[in-house]
């Protein structure tokens, strides 16, 4: 079938998930985008093991996560529960920040240099981690 | 041979609809996202729609988007475009398209089918 | 959307000059910025993505610069068919959209 056992080149395996991290920036949603079309999602951290994972992969570097309050609560692009889910937000973030003079608050989260996650304006062209779960129907390795 | 070939184009009323098809051949068509890009008569390009390997994610042109639909069938190696509502700013070649992805995190067309040409006229 | 503007819209040039075609955007688009080449009849071709790097079987007289929102493709000795319509495209934001094109004519 077109279920995918081990991962794309250039794409990590780690507990039965593949993770490819961007080096450079996109938008929010234009880094969704292209996970999606590689049949992937933005990352969802559900776990403190998978966070220490990523972080070791990205380093000190604003990276966008799945995870935007868009739509009024805080939702992971998977449909994983927030409310019930891991966490690992700066102090006092979420804050939803007017401040920056970039119209609206802040509806997108990210890892910031020290891991922890903030909320930012989404358009920020931040770099961006996929993750997609083995044995699914799933993305082509780069060919060019 | 690496190639596309589309088919399904031709001559249809505004208001009408018309199903493209492209044929994929000497690649995994089954993990290489695709797309559907236009080119009026004597104009430039225009991307029109695409679609992931799986076929579980599909994006559209504000132009087109409740208009066309854009499908593949893995297990024929086959992409479609289903158009319906057809206007006349809708004419011209369409051409099926092969999304490279790049280890920067692009996505280009690396890969052209020879187009076929859809005219909508009464 | 992000509009590409391609100039010069005509570059008539004879064989063995040098090519220059520009590509700005009207806002940064990082280095996700690919060039096409499209001969009369054809389909276009890819040259350069990421904007420098050459596509696949590609002769190095081609080459890409630029990032951000300013970007240059370059023929460095133009042959006879090379004279052909050439076009832009980014990727940075949805939707892809492409340049106005630059024709490349015999002069």
């Known amino acids: 079938g077109s279920e995918r056992t081990c991962c794309p080149v250039n794409w990590v395996e780690h507990e039965r998930s593949c993770y490819w991290f961007s080096r450079s920036g996109k938008a929010w949603a234009d880094a969704d985008n292209y996970c999606r079309l590689e049949d992937a999602h933005l990352v969802v951290v559900t776990s403190w093991e998978e966070q220490k994972f990523v972080q070791h992969h990205i380093g000190p570097v604003n990276t966008w996560m799945g995870l935007h309050d868009q739509n009024g609560p805080w939702k992971w692009v998977d449909g994983t529960d927030y409310e019930t889910g891991f966490k690992n937000w700066r102090p006092e973030q979420p804050d939803d920040w007017y401040g920056h003079g970039l119209g609206g608050g802040e509806d997108c989260a990210h890892f910031t240099d020290d891991g922890r996650w903030n909320d930012d304006v989404c358009q920020r062209p931040y770099r961006w981690v996929c993750e997609t779960e083995l044995d699914k129907a799933s993305q082509e390795p780069p060919l060019l | 041979e690496v190639q596309l070939l589309e088919s399904g184009g031709g001559l249809v009323q505004p208001g009408g609809s018309l199903r493209l098809s492209c044929a994929a051949s000497?690649?995994?068509?089954?993990?290489?996202?695709m797309s559907w890009v236009r080119q009026a008569p004597g104009k430039g390009l225009e991307w029109v729609s695409a679609?992931?390997?799986?076929?579980?994610?599909?994006f559209y042109a504000d132009s087109v988007k409740g208009r066309f639909t854009i499908s593949r069938d893995n297990s024929k190696n086959t992409l479609y475009l289903q158009m319906n509502s057809l206007r006349a700013e809708d004419t011209a070649v369409y051409y099926c398209a092969k999304l490279g992805t790049t280890v920067s995190g692009g996505h280009y067309f690396d890969l052209w089918g020879r187009g076929t040409l859809v005219t909508v006229s009464s | 959307e992000i509009v590409l503007t391609q100039s010069p819209a005509t570059l008539s040039l004879s064989p063995g000059e040098r090519a220059t075609l520009s590509c700005r955007a009207s806002q940064s688009v990082s280095s996700y910025l690919a060039w096409y080449q499209q001969k009369p009849g054809q389909a276009p071709r890819l040259l350069i993505y990421d904007a420098s790097k050459r596509a696949t079987g590609i002769p190095a007289r081609f080459s890409g610069s630029g990032s951000g929102t300013d970007f240059t493709l370059t023929i460095s000795s133009l042959e006879p068919e090379d004279f052909a319509v050439y076009y832009c495209?980014?990727?940075?934001?949805?939707?892809?959209?492409f340049g106005g094109g630059t024709k490349v004519e015999i002069k």
């Open positions: 679609i992931s390997g799986a076929g579980a994610s599909t």
């Open positions: 495209q980014q990727d940075s934001n949805h939707p892809l959209t």
């Open positions: 000497g690649f995994t068509f089954s993990t290489s996202p």
